[in-house]
């Protein structure tokens, strides 16, 4: 059945080389004395991307990251020596790794770094206006970075700066044991989560922090922290990780007698991202890696996208789950987790919940308390001993929208763009991996808007070497994606419509919401453009309906490439054909000489099918004829290539090989009539490769071909031998390069 394509593979897979060659990636490959380009701050108004790294802070131009300014902010030699004496690694630890980079006000950023295991913060002046072109460190104003940045660069930090106050989830000690959610800066005493209570935080790894309004009253604003942590004893058998969402009220100032300078409104709930399995055993993706909030229309109800991986070392998998804030709030209004002692199971709390309900922000909206310091003792006592909710937050549709389990990589980052298409709005996900690739995925509703189909549009390699992607930002203004890793920063456009192909069908099959067929090319779709002229079908990707009136038009890549190749009796030949789309299925037809009838090629000992094409072994005269390579995708059939194979019997072979190129042997002439000069050269080369007694290796042979090719080029400057590159490609393949043929500009490869 050719109707079903391979939906789990990316339609297009682009190597770093291909990305560079097609001008689809710009890379900043880092400085020799820096690394760890992990902390991003996007400023759309100034058109800058600020990046915190090792001993440096960068300001990149969003248009082209090759244009940047930098601030050098290392630690003193004394501090570095102290760090070294404490047994830390001089290169990987005893430096200033920037962990916090936030907009402080209209003119300044606030930055914090590890400071060689002595956290430090300062302000960076950026000026009032972009044209001020100011980017400098306030050298006179350094602050203690404790509770803001971790000591250890390996530890994750989540932070948020609002109204002059910094909310941070980090480790506040040298040993990396005292994890807390802090509020520092501002005019108030710092506030933190309870110390020495694993029910509050249990060795957490903080991911991100976000301010989300609860109502129209700013007093109800909450800060949500996303993190993963060790499951509490009794919550799970054995050692397990749980993904969490934690909440605190922005106007929480701690308790009066108990929980003094500690959060009184902290609550946390588990985030579930799992796939239902057989026997009721679900496959859980518990290792939360990244979170993206899609704010659309209602800022009180963003959609939360979470990237998760599995905890198991045996079974490696990744998933993306979507959560609604209404579901999150419902859980925080549900039962609290409770247990009577360390040996008891966790149960939903059944007793009387004090008023006002713990976790509620003091405001006029939900009760008459002006401050958390006024909260009754029983509320504080309850809050202190019941920080966790009993019910977890389940994803929308109760399952992930993207799952990857059969690959050698895991997801690390996500950003999402909402795109207007002809048939509605689509969320396009850009997912970063631990091997330096970015997946472009669109979730497409099937029957209902909740039943989603994931379509993997592209897999792009954005760094030269495999390196985990640790930061991603998306500029809707510039329509660009910015990616950070240990090695550097990369920039790529959100869409590359032209690479899908030169035909309406190819554009339609891509199902990329950014792209549509404009009558002559696959180009960026704008909802404002005249609908009549735009062909796009994201939901179904059906070219038969949307491009049917264009099928007669052969100017847009519909006419297949035609090739004639020659094979020698009893030898083997390879008919190369691999479609641009990885999702297309290829099938071959054979048409005997002087026959109309085409038959589908069946694979046997004589014919071997590979991803790159068809290998015909031990050629016979009966194999002569036309070979048609078809790509089938989503019900649409496209003929990519027509190869005419001529099988030469062995008795004519010697005669052919010993004839000079210009000789007038009738057989040679007959064969040469249909051949271009470059094909003749190629054919001769090929025959030599098969039969030459003195060439032991292909390398030796290629060497000879290239030498002759260079000689010919010197003699005939106007001549471009069409197949001189042929052997080069063979050699590259020999080296193990995974290449797909997108065009058929070369003579088919023969073995």
């Amino acid at each position: 059945n050719y109707q079903n394509g391979k939906n789990n593979v990316p339609r297009l897979k682009l190597s770093y080389k291909e990305m560079l060659e097609s001008n689809n990636v710009i890379t900043f490959n880092g400085l020799a004395n820096s690394s760890s380009y992990h902390t991003f701050l996007l400023d759309e108004e100034r058109s800058r991307l600020y990046v915190g790294a090792k001993d440096h802070i960068f300001s990149f131009d969003l248009v082209n990251i090759k244009d940047f300014q930098k601030i050098v902010w290392p630690v003193s030699y004394t501090r570095r020596d102290e760090c070294k004496w404490a047994g830390k690694d001089i290169l990987k630890e005893c430096a200033n790794f920037i962990k916090v980079l936030k907009a402080y006000n209209q003119t300044h950023l606030y930055a914090c770094g590890t400071g060689a295991f002595h956290p430090i913060c300062t302000y960076i002046e950026i000026g009032h206006h972009p044209e001020d072109n100011i980017f400098k460190l306030e050298n006179s104003h350094f602050e203690n970075g404790r509770g803001k940045s971790p000591y250890d660069p390996k530890l994750l930090t989540a932070s948020l700066l609002i109204d002059g106050e910094l909310y941070s989830g980090t480790a506040a000690d040298f040993m990396g044991r005292d994890f807390a959610i802090f509020r520092t800066l501002g005019h108030h005493h710092p506030i933190r989560t309870e110390q020495h209570d694993s029910r509050w935080l249990n060795d957490p790894k903080f991911i991100s922090a976000h301010l989300i309004s609860e109502s129209d009253n700013p007093e109800d604003d909450k800060v949500y922290f996303f993190f993963r942590e060790n499951a509490i004893d009794g919550e799970h058998s054995g050692k397990a990780t749980h993904a969490r969402i934690g909440q605190i009220c922005k106007n929480d100032f701690g308790g009066h007698r108990s929980l003094v300078n500690k959060w009184t409104t902290f609550l946390k709930a588990r985030l579930i991202c799992s796939v239902p399995g057989p026997n009721g055993i679900d496959t859980h993706f518990d290792e939360l890696q990244d979170v993206f909030l899609m704010n659309f229309k209602d800022p009180k109800n963003p959609v939360v996208y979470g990237v998760f991986t599995t905890s198991s070392n045996i079974f490696k998998g990744s998933a993306v789950c979507m959560y609604s804030m209404s579901d999150v709030r419902r859980v925080f209004l549900g039962p609290y987790a409770h247990r009577d002692g360390p040996n008891y199971q966790w149960v939903p709390y059944q007793g009387r919940v004090p008023y006002p309900r713990p976790g509620t922000c003091p405001s006029k909206t939900f009760g008459g308390f002006d401050s958390t310091k006024d909260l009754p003792d029983d509320v504080i006592t309850f809050a202190r001993s019941h920080p966790a909710m009993y019910n977890p937050v389940f994803p929308m549709n109760n399952r992930p929208i993207v799952i990857k389990t059969d690959v050698n990589y895991q997801f690390t980052q996500i950003v999402v763009d909402r795109v207007d298409a002809e048939d509605g709005q689509y969320d396009v996900m850009f997912i970063g991996t631990d091997v330096g690739t970015v997946l472009k995925v669109v979730s497409i509703p099937k029957e209902t808007w909740y039943d989603l189909e994931e379509v993997l549009l592209e897999e792009m390699t954005v760094f030269r070497e495999p390196t985990a992607i640790s930061a991603m930002e998306l500029s809707t203004k510039q329509q660009q994606l910015y990616i950070g890793s240990t090695a550097g920063v990369a920039q790529l456009p959100l869409h590359r419509c032209d690479i899908y192909g030169k035909a309406c069908a190819e554009c339609c099959l891509a199902r990329d919401p950014y792209c549509a067929w404009d009558g002559s090319a696959c180009s960026r779709y704008f909802p404002t453009a005249k609908r009549r002229t735009r062909r796009q079908d994201i939901r179904n990707g059906d070219p038969l309906t949307h491009c049917s009136d264009l099928h007669h038009d052969n100017h847009h890549g519909h006419s297949p490439e035609e090739r004639i190749i020659y094979g020698v009796e009893n030898s083997s030949t390879f008919l190369e054909c691999s479609p641009k789309s990885q999702r297309a299925l290829v099938y071959w037809q054979f048409q005997r000489r002087n026959e109309e009838r085409k038959e589908e090629i069946r694979v046997d000992d004589h014919i071997i099918r590979t991803d790159q094409g068809l290998l015909l072994r031990s050629l016979q005269q009966k194999d002569s004829g036309n070979y048609l390579c078809h790509a089938v995708e989503h019900g649409f059939i496209q003929t990519l290539l027509k190869v005419t194979l001529e099988v030469i019997d062995t008795e004519h072979l010697e005669e052919l090989l010993h004839k000079d190129d210009d000789g007038d042997g009738s057989k040679t002439k007959e064969m040469s009539n249909s051949m271009t000069p470059s094909q003749k050269v190629w054919y001769r080369d090929f025959m030599q490769l098969i039969n030459h007694p003195n060439l032991n290796t292909m390398d030796e042979f290629c060497e000879q071909v290239w030498k002759r090719d260079r000689k010919q080029r010197r003699q005939r400057p106007g001549h471009t031998p069409g197949n001189s590159n042929k052997w080069k490609h063979l050699q590259e393949n020999k080296k193990g390069r995974n290449r797909r043929t997108h065009e058929f500009e070369r003579a088919p490869r023969s073995v």
């Epitope: 404490a86 970075g145 509770g147 000591y151 040298f174 040993m175 710092p190 007698r257 300078n261 202190r384």
Partner: antibody, heavy 123, light 111 residues
Amino acid sequence: EVQLLESGGGLVQPGGSLRLSCAASGFDFDSYEMNWVRQAPGKGLEWVSGISWNSGWIDYADSVKGRFTISRDNSKNTLYLQMNSLRAEDTAVYYCARSGYSSSWFDPDFDYWGQGTLVTVSS
Amino acid sequence: QSVLTQPPSVSGAPGQRVTISCTGSSSNIGAGYDVHWYQQLPGTAPKLLIYGNSNRPSGVPDRFSGSKSGTSASLAITGLQAEDEADYYCQSYAGPNPYVVFGGGTKLTVL
């Protein structure tokens, strides 16, 4: 007024056991972390053990680990230290102290101390 | 051997100013942790004198002040009085093992 009153000290032979108590009053006992700190005759102060308000966190100095056990009864406003396998070097005045966490960075300080109880380990 | 190093003794005449130093390492004071100071009058329990490097609890005279820089801290006493004769201890957080550390103590003698 915050008051901490230790009891249970005395003379004990090496290898013996003692249980110290600290009765607390004048504050919400169940809201505070509590500690035992000792001082050998003519020597400095040494932190011995600490316990969080709900006993969820308990820690000991290496010198007493495995021999001493700290506990608390919030309903009785009392802190305990069970000392087993006592050695001569455990001879000291044992103070009960409350963690104040008065500083900005929540680094433990001891804002209130009891008068101490003397433990003598000798044969 | 204490983790925090203090001079065993200091002395001064009434009305004079004395300072007591407390030196740690990059994993306690040098890690940015707060330093607290205690006064122990002869035959009594220690009393919190300075918390969080430089803050005085209510009831402590302003003659006592604390400061911290890098891996060390110091306690300054101005206008020395006879009743200030006592042992003074510095203390810092140290992470999990041990939880807190004390200095060896400094005996202040008012001449």
